[in-house]
Interface confidence: medium
């Protein structure tokens, strides 16, 4: 995947060069203000009928350096009695995210954009029953 | 989140320039190979006991330009009979993501990294009953 400028507002920008090492003004901006970083983790992971655990995925050479990845606790869902319901499955909801990776030993700092697929939480779905022909 | 305009892990880097011009390789690397981009949208949004809809959030000056945001279809969860269960709530699972925003009219191209909080899907949780004192 590549980020192609929508317009050619910049003259003489060759596409093949543009994507390699563009000098960009990399300002980091939080569109939700401090609200994002300070937001408390929700308790949905314990209260859900398809509960999950969070595992720390840590890489000091990446931004964000700490990413929490969800894993469903059970293959089945938990019913109102707290028992596993064998007609219902816990499934992982995944999200594709962008991360910045620092190119090793680079001064001035050089970053590359990477895509990652991370588990965010779990949801409960009815099992699909395969009918014999 | 906070940015402080001073520093230097790289020698001879003037504080004021530090965040100004860093190189970013704007080719987007898939850390999970083709698995990420080619993955089929799942049908969990319809099969879940807490179904959701996806709304298109589009911005041509952003990468990714299209982000699909989830919204829970109902306040309650759907039971095995397809009826809404008033003891169970559908709740939105949110994820903080990074996006690249192009600064308008910028030459050379200037991007800023923004954080966004997006809804990814819904899960079903037991309603919290508030007890009267």
């Amino acid at each position: 995947a590549a980020i192609i400028p929508q317009s050619s507002a910049c003259p003489n920008t060759e596409a093949k060069d543009f994507l390699q090492n563009v000098k960009v003004n990399l300002k980091v901006f939080n569109s939700l203000g401090a609200k994002v970083s300070s937001r408390r983790p929700s308790d949905y992971l314990n209260r859900s009928t398809s509960p999950w655990t969070l595992h720390r995925n840590e890489d000091p050479d990446r931004y964000p350096s700490v990413i929490w990845e969800a894993q469903c606790r059970h293959q089945r869902c938990v019913n109102a009695e707290g028992k596993l319901d064998h007609h219902m499955n816990s499934v992982l909801i995944q999200q594709e995210i962008l991360v910045l990776k620092r190119e090793p030993e680079s001064c001035p700092f050089t970053f590359r954009v990477e895509k990652m697929l991370v588990g965010v939480g779990c949801t409960c779905v009815a099992s699909i029953v395969r009918q014999a022909a | 989140a906070a940015i402080i305009p001073q520093s230097s892990a790289c020698p001879n880097t003037e504080a004021k320039d530090f965040l100004q011009n860093v190189k970013v390789n704007l080719k987007v690397f898939n850390s999970l190979g083709a698995k990420v981009s080619s993955r089929r949208p799942s049908d969990y949004l319809n099969r879940s006991t807490s179904p959701w809809t996806l709304h298109r959030n589009e911005d041509p000056d952003r990468y990714p330009s299209v982000i699909w945001e989830a919204q829970c279809r109902h306040q309650r969860c759907v039971n095995a009979e397809g009826k809404l269960d008033h003891h169970m709530n559908s709740v939105l699972i949110q994820q903080e993501i990074l996006v690249l925003k192009r600064e308008p009219e910028s030459c050379p191209f200037t991007f800023r990294v923004e954080k966004m909080l997006v809804g990814v899907g819904c899960t079903c949780v037991a309603s919290i009953v508030r007890q009267a004192a």
Epitope: D61, Y63, P64 | V113
Partner: nanobody, 119 residues
């Protein structure tokens, strides 16, 4: 959950000394550069000092060079700031912050500890 807890602030006379501490948890402390930053009353955040993950290099803002010393103990997951020859203009809330690959960009910092320099 990443947590940073500062301590050691207080009221001190000009020319006096204080030692700030920061206890870290929820991440691999020894893998990250760490910072002290401060915010004087009515002012913006100001970078004070940085120490690399292994303690091999330190960096200081010009305003504190020669007076402040940053150090760390990776075994104890702790960061320190020894402040000598304190001046009235050092009065601020001091925060420790976890470094990221983005220069001087912080997602995580503590609740802060107030240092007041006054006679």
């Amino acid at each position: 959950e990443v947590q940073l807890v500062e301590s050691g602030g207080g009221l001190v006379q000009p020319g006096g000394s204080l030692r700030l501490s920061c206890a870290a948890s929820g991440f691999t402390f020894s893998s990250y550069g760490m910072y002290w930053v401060r915010q004087a009353p009515g002012k913006g955040l100001e970078w004070v000092a940085k120490i690399e993950q292994d303690g091999s290099e330190e960096y200081y803002a010009d305003s504190v060079k020669g007076r402040f010393t940053i150090s760390r103990d990776n075994a104890k997951k702790s960061l320190y700031l020894q402040m000598n020859s304190l001046r009235a203009e050092d009065t601020a809330v001091y925060y420790c912050a976890k470094g990221e690959i983005l220069p001087l960009y912080f997602d995580y910092w503590g609740q802060g500890t107030l240092v007041t320099v006054s006679s």
